[in-house]
């Protein structure tokens, strides 16, 4: 049996229904069997877990996703073995295997792989700060969302009106969410906002920086 699946990965927003397309061509016999299984990201195919079987004219959802899986066409004997997965969770991200068996059609292995990513908006990020906050010193502002798929990008902005910082005194890394402030001055003091963004949305946190004279302690 030759199985056809999309070559590009599938992305589905959190809570929506994913349709994992799988089609095939074979003269369906009574021994026809379909199995859908799931592998977590980074795990080998050998560690797949069955989530649905079809055999002897009957459908058998199985495992932790059993209440949320069904077939687009039941019975899946018309050449369409597409899986529907409702109310997708972040833990549904991974590789799905569509395997069709139909003896004596052994021309190919009857296996198709689909990568599913569940799209999750960024969670409210945590803003933190470390380093010397005295005049002339350097500090790092950090921002990180515990959730978000694809991984959010981070952008720091300073709120309010303030003099333009000298070039190179503010360097940010959109991937790590870190903002490095060097050669601090009293005018560096203020509120900084980090916005975490992906295709599903954005979330933000704020942090107030107080730059002090070298003789004084650090106040955050």
């Amino acid at each position: 049996v030759e199985v056809k699946v999309p070559t590009e990965p599938l992305s589905t927003p959190l809570g929506k229904t994913a349709e994992l397309t799988c089609t095939y061509s074979t003269s369906v016999g009574d021994s026809f069997a379909l199995e859908w299984s799931f592998v977590q990201p980074g795990k080998p195919i050998s560690e797949s877990h069955p989530i649905l079987y079809f055999t002897n004219g009957h459908l058998y959802p199985t495992g932790s996703k059993s209440k949320r899986v069904s077939l687009l066409q039941n019975p899946p004997t018309v050449g369409v073995a597409t899986l529907k997965l409702t109310d997708v969770h972040p833990s549904d991200t991974g590789t799905y295997l569509c395997q069709v068996n139909n003896p004596p059609d052994f021309y190919t292995n009857g296996l198709g792989l689909i990568n599913l990513t569940v799209l999750v908006p960024p969670s409210n990020p945590l803003c933190s700060q470390s380093g010397q906050t005295s005049v002339g010193g350097s500090t790092a502002l950090r921002c990180s969302s515990s959730e978000g798929a694809p991984k959010p990008v981070y952008n720091w902005v300073r709120l309010g009106t303030f003099p333009t910082p000298s070039p190179g005194s503010m360097v940010q890394d959109e991937v790590s969410g870190q903002l490095i402030l060097t050669n601090l001055s009293l005018t560096s003091s203020g509120t900084y906002r980090c916005v975490a963004t992906n295709q599903m949305g954005s979330a933000s946190c704020e942090l107030t920086l107080s730059v002090t004279e070298p003789s004084q302690g650090r106040v955050a």
Partner: antibody, heavy 118, light 107 residues
């Protein structure tokens, strides 16, 4: 050699019923998917039903679904098509055909003519 | 449903001619295409399946090519026995459908 011989065609009134048969020989019938395909006079070919090797799975196009029933008797090497609620547009030569491992049709019978007319 | 469209509907040719018939599918059918030859009053005969595979006994002057949505049947040197009607059929997902046919007649 493979032989498929259809029978049971004839003249029937609209709304009537007819049962076609196909006698198979020369191959292992019980291992083969089978189909019925029809051809209206002067027209092209239309697949009308299929059945799996042991009869568990049957399929139909929308044009005949609910009116036609395909069945088989592997002990008798026979394929059947029960046609109910016949319409004028069902008038055609009906062929029985064996399916390959993929659903193309590698052997055909000579056909039997069904005429639906008042 | 997948629609199959053949062109031309009729083709006039002479013995020895190279003949090409085209079949288009309304959506991707990969290589799941068969070709049949039918003579008047006779049942169709399988010529090609999987777009390009010839069953045993089919003369090598017949060849098939294509994948996706566009396919061709070629007769490299037309013989007297080849004047007939030719049909394509997809063997992908149900319902399996045929093209409307191409009649190859003597010029």
């Amino acid at each position: 050699q493979v032989q498929l011989v259809e029978s049971g065609g004839g003249l029937v009134k609209p709304g009537g019923s007819l049962r076609l048969s196909c006698a198979a020989s020369g191959f292992t019938f019980s291992n083969s998917g089978m189909s019925w395909i029809r051809q209206a006079p002067g027209k092209g070919l239309e697949w009308v039903s299929s059945i799996s090797d042991g009869g568990l799975y049957t399929h139909y196009p929308d044009s005949v679904k609910g009116r036609f029933t395909i069945s088989r008797d592997n002990a008798k090497n026979s394929l059947y098509l029960q046609m109910n609620s016949l319409r004028a547009e069902d008038t055609a030569v009906y062929y029985c055909a064996r399916q390959g491992v993929r659903p193309f049709f590698d052997y055909w019978g000579q056909g039997t003519l069904v005429t639906v007319s008042s | 449903d997948i629609q199959m469209t053949q062109s031309p509907s009729t083709l006039s040719a002479s013995v020895g001619d190279r003949v090409t018939i085209t079949c288009r599918a309304s959506e991707n059918i990969y290589s799941y295409l068969a070709w049949y030859q039918q003579k008047p009053g006779k049942a169709p005969k399988l010529l090609i399946y999987n777009a390009e595979t010839l069953p045993e006994g089919v003369p090598s002057r017949f060849s098939g090519s294509g994948s996706g949505t566009e396919f061709t049947l070629t007769i490299s040197s037309l013989q007297p026995d080849d004047f007939a009607t030719y049909y394509c059929q997809h063997h992908y997902v149900i319902p399996w459908t045929f093209g409307q046919g191409t009649k190859v007649e003597i010029k």
